[in-house]
Interface confidence: low
């Protein structure tokens, strides 16, 4: 999906009002310095691409993020403010339902959510320009 035509300001508002708090809740009990940020993004469409990948794609050691509150709110924000996004996610959602049955918070998941926090912060920087 090409995130170029999303309403970035609306997504930013959704992040600031709710998603950021849900990410903090998920990470509660971990030190802010515990994980190094190794994932980066260059502009807002790039950031959303990486955010979508980390939030919804299953990875080794962490297959449970999609059902978290921050993930559901992220999905809603992208569906509302990115034209045509929800249509591209129908097959992915069905696959997700089959693949994710248990909800376990692993260290890998905590690290992954820490990366997400970094990506969201970069998405929200006012100096960040669209290409």
């Amino acid at each position: 999906y090409d995130f170029t035509n999303c309403d970035f300001e609306k997504i930013k508002a959704a992040y600031l009002s709710t998603i950021s708090k849900d990410l903090i809740t998920y990470m509660s009990g971990t030190k802010s310095t515990e994980f190094n940020n190794t994932v980066s993004c260059s502009n807002r469409p790039h950031c959303l691409t990486e955010i979508q990948s980390l939030t919804f794609n299953p990875t080794a050691g962490c297959a449970s993020l999609a059902k978290e509150m921050f993930a559901m709110k992220t999905k809603a924000a992208l569906a509302i403010w990115c034209p045509g996004y929800s249509e591209t996610q129908i097959n992915a959602t069905q696959a997700m339902k089959k693949a994710r049955k248990s909800k376990v918070t692993t260290n890998k998941c905590l690290e992954q959510v820490s990366q997400l926090q970094g990506l969201w912060r970069r998405f929200n920087r006012p100096l960040l320009k669209q290409q």
Partner: antibody
Framework: EVQLVESGGGLVQPGGSLRLSCAAS????????MTWVRQAPGKGLEWVSS????????YYADSVKGRFTISRDNAKNSLSLQMNSLRAEDTAVYYC??????????????WGQGVLVTVSS | DIVMTQTPLSLSVTPGEPASISCRSS???????????LHWYLQKPGQSPQLLIY???HRASGVPDRFSGSGSDTDFTLKISRVEAEDVGVYYC?????????FGGGTKVEIK
Amino acid sequence: EVQLVESGGGLVQPGGSLRLSCAASGFTFSNYDMTWVRQAPGKGLEWVSSITFASSYIYYADSVKGRFTISRDNAKNSLSLQMNSLRAEDTAVYYCTRGGGAYHGGSLDVWGQGVLVTVSS
Amino acid sequence: DIVMTQTPLSLSVTPGEPASISCRSSQSLLHINGYTYLHWYLQKPGQSPQLLIYLVSHRASGVPDRFSGSGSDTDFTLKISRVEAEDVGVYYCEQTLQTPYSFGGGTKVEIK
């Protein structure tokens, strides 16, 4: 045309200082992470330092930490490398490079022509 | 720190013949996001390096399809299906999984 042009190289004595500059054009400079890479005469490539697009994160190789400072001015489309306490082993061609962004995984997709720094007495 | 090791050091190839360069990392370059942070560059004689392949197997813009990258985890390969005269130079692999980023020592490719 996407272009990176380095300047500021030259001959300097051990212990001396030099400031390298890189002028970027043909792309939205503020969207990209930037990196300095060097190559000693007849040797391979060595990563020196990287700076993220909004200067939020800065990284250095151990060999230059505490002596070199990377900085950028997004308003002027310029990247700099301040080199202090220079040593003979810092002699190299220094390349200004562009990080390819999230899709390219931090690979360096644009390189300048390079500028020679010679540290010798 | 991650150490990158390339083999062979040099390679002499007949035009039209295939060539293969190996790159090994001291630890896995696979990130939890599913991407593997390994890239290939070519430095032609007297020129600056240029990006050939990023994230193991993706050809950079303008790179001919005779170049291909493969591998996973710690073992990677750059293949040239049919070497041409313009392919001479030194090939480098690089990891950007974590700082300090690091390059392999290089493989010099020349024409027989």
